[in-house]
């Protein structure tokens, strides 16, 4: 025998109190799949969260973090403080990158500079707290009169592009 509730579409619930009639989800609730016996309460984006997408009868609200914070976890479960480039967020707060490491983003930890010599290249531009070193041609390629030219910064660094 087919369950009468299976006919209830997303945005409704199967109301046992009303002879298993499909009733619309009450305000501030939703059902994202059919055949639900209850509607779920909409997520509220408060405090460090702000609403990215409003709740509808068929979809939960989506939150994002306010300025100065970034999301962690699926569906932005938690907001974590941004640091400045050149810093990393430790469990004790934002801390400058140690010498020999860099962070060009507002999140994550400081990464060791590239060691150009491992690939037989020379350092063209020194690293900073905010930028990796730039490797140039191998030392043998730099004849005495050749000039080292600092190239323009790349248009896109890892981590900055959308998926």
């Amino acid at each position: 025998l087919q369950d009468p509730c299976s006919n209830c579409p997303a945005g409704t619930f199967c109301d046992n109190n009303r002879n298993q009639i499909c009733s619309p989800c009450p305000p501030n609730s939703f059902s994202s799949a059919g055949g639900q016996r209850t509607c779920d309460i909409c997520r509220q984006c408060k405090g460090v969260f702000r609403t990215r997408k409003e709740c509808s009868s068929t979809h939960n609200a989506e939150c994002e973090c306010i300025e100065g914070f970034h999301c962690l976890g699926p569906q932005c479960t938690r907001c974590e403080k941004d640091c400045r480039p050149g810093q990393e967020l430790t469990k004790k707060g934002c801390k400058d990158c140690c010498f020999g490491t860099f962070n060009d983003q507002k999140r994550g930890i400081c990464r060791p500079w590239t060691n150009c010599s491992l690939d037989g290249k020379s350092v063209l531009v020194n690293g900073t707290k905010e930028r990796d070193v730039v490797c140039g041609p191998s030392p043998a390629d730099l004849s005495p009169g050749a000039s080292s030219v600092t190239p323009p910064a790349p248009a896109r660094e890892p981590g900055h592009s959308p998926q």
């Epitope: 430790t90 469990k91 999140r107 060791p112 890892p158 981590g159």
Partner: antibody, heavy 120, light 110 residues
Framework: QVQLVQSGAEVKKPGASVKVSCKAS????????MHWVRQAPGQGLEWMGW????????NYAQKFQGRVTMTRDTSISTAYMELSRLRSDDTAVYYC?????????????WGQGTLVTVSS | SYVLTQPPSVSVAPGETARITCGGD??????VHWYQKKPDQAPVLVVY???YRPSGIPERISGSNSGNTATLTLSRVEAGDEADYYC????????????FGGGTQLIILG
């Protein structure tokens, strides 16, 4: 969707070199660092190094320095790992794995692995 | 370089809770990631940054990290959870930034 597809199994003689490829799709290749990790038979996971596909900058685990070279070809969204002077204990499955967009988090997508067998 | 220590194996009956530990000096100050590795399959990230699950990972998998020990907890374990589990951290201060624990084989009894 994000996919990393690696080249097929290789059999090499001791002293030879092997070059494993990892073709990325479903995202901007130059936007995410690529790491290489290996697992020898009956052993655990071992991190080998990373490459920044945008600049070509690399960092290798000290154990592999002088024997490993990581490169990329941005025109075909492919990363490469070359290991030279192979020994029998380099027999392992080699994986490429993508960093999720910032350093300090877990490696979120992995290739299927490439078995490299070193045998005389 | 930094060392992560895991027990070689953990055995648990179906439906019970498995706890896999990962020890390291002041590991609580680092961000720990956990991977599940099944034979002939690529590793899968199951927990990142101590306690966050990537989408698609069930809620019964959780992580915690403080002091000198990080813990991966699998509640209501199923036969499909049988695998090797590896903890991992990044250690920028060493010449080997990517560090994995030795791995723990989760054995489902019965």
């Amino acid at each position: 969707q994000v996919q990393l597809v690696q080249s097929g199994a290789e059999v090499k003689k001791p002293g030879a070199s092997v070059k494993v490829s990892c073709k990325a799709s479903g995202y901007t290749f130059t936007g995410y660092y690529m790491h290489w990790v290996r697992q020898a038979p009956g052993q655990g996971l071992e991190w080998m190094g990373w490459i920044n596909p945008n600049s070509g900058g690399t960092n290798y685990a000290q154990k592999f320095q002088g024997r490993v070279t990581m490169t990329r070809d941005t025109s075909i969204s492919t990363a490469y790992m070359e290991l030279s002077r192979l020994r029998s204990d380099d027999t392992a499955v080699y994986y490429c794995a993508r960093e999720p967009g910032y350093y300090g988090s877990g490696l979120d997508y992995w290739g299927q692995g490439t078995l490299v067998t070193v045998s005389s | 370089s930094y060392v992560l220590t895991q027990p070689p194996s953990v055995s648990v009956a179906p439906g019970e809770t498995a706890r896999i530990t990962c020890g390291g000096d002041d590991i609580g100050d680092k961000r720990v990631h956990w991977y599940q590795k099944k034979p002939d399959q690529a590793p899968v990230l199951v927990v990142y940054e101590d306690r966050y699950r990537p989408s698609g990972i069930p809620e019964r998998i959780s992580g915690s990290n403080s002091g000198n020990t990080a813990t991966l907890t699998l509640s209501r374990v199923e036969a499909g959870d049988e695998a090797d589990y590896y903890c991992q951290v990044w250690d920028s201060s060493s010449d080997h930034p990517g560090v994995f624990g030795g791995g723990t084989q989760l054995i489902i009894l019965g």
